[in-house]
């Protein structure tokens, strides 16, 4: 599932490049392992912002698929309460390219620990 999430992120990156979306997004670029589920939640919520701002059907479908995949991969630990983690709004705002790069990085963390 996580490998499919990465290919969806690459697809979103390709689709966005032709659209010139200027949004800045809350981005966790240095994820601590004990906060990775919280960070994933922030990435997914921000991904929905991309979908809404783009108004693009392909981006919408890909984002929705990515959320479904991530949900199923995290169904066992998605409700784990991680303490001492940053709220989404406390994170640095970065451009879409940097956001997606950091997103791939956190997904790789999940791959390495699964």
């Amino acid at each position: 599932n996580w490998v499919n999430v990465i290919s969806d992120l690459k697809k979103i990156e390709d689709l966005i490049q032709s659209m010139h979306i200027d949004a800045t997004l809350y981005t966790e670029s240095d994820v601590h392992p004990s906060c990775k589920v919280t960070a994933m939640k922030c990435f997914l919520l921000e991904l929905q912002v991309i979908s809404l701002e783009s108004g693009d059907a392909s981006i919408h479908d890909t984002v929705e698929n990515l959320i479904i995949l991530a949900n199923n991969s995290l169904s066992s630990n998605g409700n784990v309460t991680e303490s001492g983690c940053k709220e989404c709004e406390e994170l640095e705002e970065k451009n879409i390219k940097e956001f997606l790069q950091s997103f791939v990085h956190i997904v790789q963390m999940f791959i390495n620990t699964s």
């Epitope: 919520l45 929905q48 979908s51 479908d61 890909t62 929705e64 959320i67 479904i68 949900n71």
Partner: antibody, heavy 122, light 112 residues
Framework: EVRLMASGGGLVKPGGSLKLSCAAS????????MSWVRQTPEKRLEWVAT????????YYPDSVKGRFTISRDNAKNTLYLQMSSLRSEDTALYYC???????????????WGQGTSVTVSS | DVLMTQTPLSLPVSLGDQASISCRSS???????????LEWYLQKPGQSPKLLIY???NRFSGVPDRFSGSGSGTDFTLKISRVEAEDLGLYYC?????????FGGGTKLEIK
Amino acid sequence: EVRLMASGGGLVKPGGSLKLSCAASEFTFSNYAMSWVRQTPEKRLEWVATISRGGDYTYYPDSVKGRFTISRDNAKNTLYLQMSSLRSEDTALYYCARRVSMITGGWAMDYWGQGTSVTVSS
Amino acid sequence: DVLMTQTPLSLPVSLGDQASISCRSSQSIVDITGNTYLEWYLQKPGQSPKLLIYKVFNRFSGVPDRFSGSGSGTDFTLKISRVEAEDLGLYYCFQDSFVPYTFGGGTKLEIK
């Protein structure tokens, strides 16, 4: 008023195939993900398949995966369910349903068609 | 898979009474983004199912306010404050937080 008309049901032998259709009208079909849900003779409901708005992504439970294929033709406003290797337990009334977007709404099936009956028996 | 258990199987009521249907999931159906995709559907005799409630407590358009949904995590309830004749039928809960999406077994609301 949203309209969904399912058709294509019938009697088929175990191991046989059948293709169901669902004609959509009175809404912009390509703006919605769509699903198939079936109801057994005992009145239990079972989710069968979901397809994304553009048709690139499909989802199935294990009970039908590899045997059923959901597809759509947005130009024809039509949803399909190709069923193969049919079993007696696939006997049910099959409904098509429109899905509200997870991102902009509640991810619910807000409108359902009237259903088409599939009987698998020798 | 998430198992959805509905109780009771059958609920005999008098018109005007309050009715309460319970739905319990085998695991929490709060998704990673914090949403709980739990719906209630009503199937009247001879008809297709119709959406009543989505995301636990949101009433679908045109649904009377005598219907209300509540709950969180694994325990959910549908309440009908004053049962009318048109409310009779089969009620189903449904989770679509996690694939495979699953329905409860159904509750038949009938006249006592």
